[in-house]
Interface confidence: low
């Protein structure tokens, strides 16, 4: 009679994380008598996965009834597979011995590979806001996937980006892997509504890549443009001066009116109007009582936007043509602006 052979027909088995792996093994003979054991790995450090004779192996079930006398199928199922279960599994036949059973023959081994999905990509942008024309970096991270092969792409508003660097760690063999990528994005004034997308594609996703997004509204600062204009006289001694604050983002803005360098009024942008590109406009106005001034007045609209150094725009108000009214000490009415302007 031919000597017993241990046959593991599958060189490799691929299983998705969370599923059950079936590791097949058959013997060609019932002789010699003795149990089968399954190991992960070979050599002295091998890990016992299943012992037909004794032990408790809660994740392992046998495919056939090993208690039957004529059984030659020693296949096992391992439930709830994780990436940590990856490795080469050996089906080993032992010969009954005293006091211990003796290893008789091993199968060729079955390599178990585990497919695990990548985690949802997390995209993070710079800690501080940046202004248009500056280049900012975004990072994208995804973890826990296997096998190592993975594709990462960057998009800005649907257009693929090319300026990025990607690393998959670790470099060597591992039960699961992580990907880290950094992309450089040049900001434009129109980017308030823009999105940066990191797209991760992996065999476990089957055409449905995972996406992580970052809104450039959290990254960009669009500084305002200022325009100070003198409106027609409302009353005989009053001039209406407006400060148009245009195309700024984010909304956080404080405006101060100065008359000849002295603070006249400070207000915070409240009732703003939004432009199509996501930036804001705001208008503040000042009623100047020209009869209170003997000389020309320098009116300055000073704007502090999003905690940045103030920018200002001035307007010289000619008062020489207006009659002087003695005894008036109120140069400006403290009138706020709630008017809306749409551009």
């Amino acid at each position: 009679e031919e000597e017993l052979q241990v046959i593991q027909p599958d060189k490799s088995v691929l299983v998705a994380a969370g599923e059950t792996a079936t590791l097949r093994c058959t013997a060609t003979s019932l002789i010699p008598v003795g149990p089968i054991q399954w190991f992960r790995g070979a050599g002295p450090g091998r890990e016992l996965i299943y012992n037909q004779k004794e032990g408790h192996f809660p994740r392992v079930t046998t495919v056939s009834d090993l208690t039957k006398r004529n059984n030659m199928d020693f296949s096992i199922r391992i439930g709830n597979i994780t990436p940590a279960d990856a490795g080469t599994y050996y089906c080993v036949k032992f010969r009954k011995g005293s006091p211990d059973d003796v290893e008789f023959k091993s199968g060729a081994g079955t390599e178990l590979s585990v497919r695990a999905k990548p985690s949802a990509p997390v995209v993070s942008g710079p800690a501080a806001r940046a202004t248009p024309q500056h280049t900012v970096s975004f990072t994208c991270e995804s973890h826990g996937f296997s096998p190592r092969d993975i594709t990462l792409k960057w998009f800005k508003n649907g257009n693929e980006l090319s300026d990025f660097q990607t690393n998959v760690d670790p470099v060597g063999e591992s039960v699961s892997y992580s990907i880290h990528s950094t992309a450089k994005v040049v900001l434009t004034r129109e980017d308030v509504h823009s999105q940066v997308i990191c797209e991760v594609a992996h065999v476990t996703l089957q055409g449905d890549p995972l996406r992580g997004t970052a809104n450039l509204s959290e990254t960009i600062r669009v500084p305002p443009t200022l325009e100070v204009t003198q409106q027609p006289v409302r009353a005989e001694n009053q001039v209406n001066v407006t400060c148009q604050v245009r195309k700024f983002y984010p909304q956080r803005l404080q405006l101060t009116w100065l008359e000849n360098g002295n603070v006249s009024r400070t207000e915070t942008a409240s009732t703003v109007t939004e432009n199509k590109d996501g930036t804001y406009n705001w208008m503040s106005w000042l009623l100047v009582n020209v009869s209170a001034h003997r000389d020309d007045v320098k009116l300055t609209c000073q704007v502090e936007h999003d905690g940045q150094p103030a920018v200002s725009k001035s307007h010289d108000l000619k008062v020489s043509a207006h009659p002087k009214e003695q005894g008036s000490n109120t140069a400006a009415e403290n009138t706020g602006s709630n008017e809306r302007n749409i551009y």
Epitope: L14, A16, E19, R115, D149, I150, T151, A201, H202, V203, T204, L205, Q206, G207, D208, P209
Partner: antibody, heavy 123, light 107 residues
Amino acid sequence: QIQLVQSGPELRKPGETVKISCKASGYSFTNYAMNWVKQAPGKVLKWMGFINTYTGEPTYADDFKGRFAFSLETSASTAYLQINNLKNEDTATYFCTRTRGYYDFDGGAFDYWGQGTSLTVSS
Amino acid sequence: DIVMTQSQKFMSTSIGDRVSVTCKASQNVGTHLAWYQQKPGQSPKALIFSASYRYIGVPDRFTGSGSGTDFTLTITNVQSEDLAEYFCQQYNTYPLTFGAGTKLELK
């Protein structure tokens, strides 16, 4: 060997429902997405969408949103296409075809096809 | 959607000839292009993926070339079993789209 075997021809009336099956064998069913393609007489092949056999999540092409539904019976390695409220223009041959994972070298190319299921919708 | 144009609906050939079937994409699809052969009453058969890679079992008289928007399937030494309809398909962008097909027939 790898095979995709589809259910037989169907004759239906407008307004009825049909469910076409596609049984896969010879490979690990959950490692490949299952796509559906429509071939109407004299018309260009039209990709209807796919179902992720790993998660069961369907993706439909715009023209096939609403009356069309992809489903799975993973234990039987079978994918299904159901068409509700049938219309005359649904008359066509429907193919199931598999694609590899997105990252793979051959991406969204269809390497194996079912034999096709002919659907005739007529009153 | 990306439109795949196969300008020749029919092509005439003789056994042993060399024939080139062309396909044009309405926008850049890189090399994400496949070719299929379909005979009457049968399902399409995969020939080429990634513009130029033959599937296992496909005779080497079938050659794919091109990238971007212009692609060609060349059949050298045409055999009688090659008389069929040939489709191109892009898989660069969803929805996946096919060309209208080119029918190869005998002169």
